[in-house]
């Protein structure tokens, strides 16, 4: 299953990055799982994941750094609290969980660049 | 003539970006001209240029946003005063001016990403 996502995104100076993950659904899925993976330093880690029912809101865990909304076959993902050390390739993985058959799609990744802001001068 | 430069550079939160431009000199040039070009929005513009004698300092014009140093066949370039709107592909062009023959080399470009900082809160 094909998954499309932008090649590059710049995090804002507040450490927030948003991108769209779009999948070409071969069937009429009602339950979809979206996982954001980060590949950097020869390591792949799970950033966040959410399972949602089509037409409903994406719900990430309360302590997740991700939020998102869905619209049809598009998922709008926002990752917050990013620091320069979080720069890396963020990969969107989409799984159509229900009804069968199960489908898996993995995007090519979005390179997110993060620059730490200069501290503001103390207000004396 | 081959010219190497990094594919991607992030400007600091102060709007400063530095990268190395390295050329494979086919001869013993004594006078070298380095030009930085910016390609964005289907347009190529000259950002800055400097001619230098091998072993001497690069001298850009006083009002130039570029500074640089040279060491052998390497030129260390710094561009300052960058804003988010200056994001683009910065291409290093190297010309061996003297002695003849003239050689020209153009790098593949360095994509410089610039993020505008959040303004600091007013100190009331």
């Amino acid at each position: 299953m094909h998954v499309a996502q932008p090649a590059v995104v710049l995090a804002s100076s507040r450490g927030i990055a948003s991108f769209v993950c779009e999948y070409a659904s071969p069937g009429k899925a009602t339950e979809v799982r979206v996982t954001v993976l980060r590949q950097a330093d020869s390591q792949v880690t799970e950033v966040c994941a959410a399972t949602y029912m089509m037409g409903n809101e994406l719900t990430f865990l309360d302590d997740s750094i991700c939020t998102g909304t869905s619209s049809g076959n598009q998922v709008n993902l926002t990752i917050q609290g990013l620091r320069a050390m979080d720069t890396g390739l963020y990969i969107c993985k989409v799984e159509l969980m229900y009804p069968p058959p199960y489908y898996l799609g993995i995007g090519n990744g979005t390179q997110i660049y993060v620059i730490d802001p200069e501290p503001c001068p103390d207000s004396d | 003539m081959h010219v190497a430069q990094p594919a991607v550079v992030l400007a600091s939160s102060r709007g400063i970006a530095s990268f190395v431009c390295e050329y494979a000199s086919p001869g013993k040039a004594t006078e070298v001209r380095v030009t930085v070009l910016r390609q964005a929005d289907s347009q190529v513009t000259e950002v800055c240029a400097a001619t230098y004698m091998m072993g001497n300092e690069l001298t850009f014009l006083d009002d130039s946003i570029c500074t640089g140093t040279s060491s052998g066949n390497q030129v260390n370039l710094t561009i300052q005063g960058l804003r988010a709107m200056d994001t683009g592909l910065y291409i290093c062009k190297v010309e061996l001016m003297y002695p003849p023959p003239y050689y020209l080399g153009i790098g593949n470009g360095t994509q410089i990403y610039v993020i505008d900082p959040e303004p600091c809160p007013d100190s009331d």
Partner: nanobody, 129 residues
Framework: QVQLQESGGGSVQAGGSLRLSCAAS????????MAWFRQAPGKEREGVAT????????AYADSVKGRFTISQDNAKNTVYLQMNSLKPEDTAMYYC??????????????????????WGQGTQVTVSS
């Protein structure tokens, strides 16, 4: 429904050999990335070997280089893992996984299993000293 079925596991003495097979149905193994992973009790699933480009490109984890060989029979839509000079530390459940060719080389990274799916049920390999 895509299905991957592993076979060939078993018990063997250290220094012995085994050949694992992974038969893919409703999935074209030759045009995708196929990988062998293993998981020991209480440990994360780790990539052992990958194959893609119809068998033209392979990659191995450092721990198995020179001992394990991954291969593919495109006509049978099957991927094999020939395991020689087995060691007790090779004891694990071995899984076949399928994924995107874009990330085939990432399979042997720490956490590389996240980039794969369509897992088989696994086949147990036990190596005794």
């Amino acid at each position: 429904q895509v299905q991957l079925q592993e076979s060939g596991g078993g018990s063997v003495q250290a220094g012995g050999s085994l050949r694992l097979s992974c038969a893919a149905s409703r999935y074209t193994a030759s045009s995708n990335c196929m990988a062998w992973f293993r998981q020991a009790p209480g440990k994360e699933r780790e990539g052992v070997a990958t194959i893609y480009n119809g068998g033209g490109s392979t990659a191995y984890a450092d721990s198995v280089k020179g001992r394990f060989t991954i291969s593919q029979d495109n006509a049978k839509n099957t991927v094999y893992l020939q395991m020689n000079s087995l060691k007790p530390e090779d004891t694990a459940m071995y899984y076949c996984g399928a994924g995107s060719p874009r990330f085939c080389a990432s399979a042997t990274m720490t956490g590389g299993h996240h980039l794969f799916g369509y897992w088989g049920q696994g086949t147990q390999v036990t190596v005794s000293s």
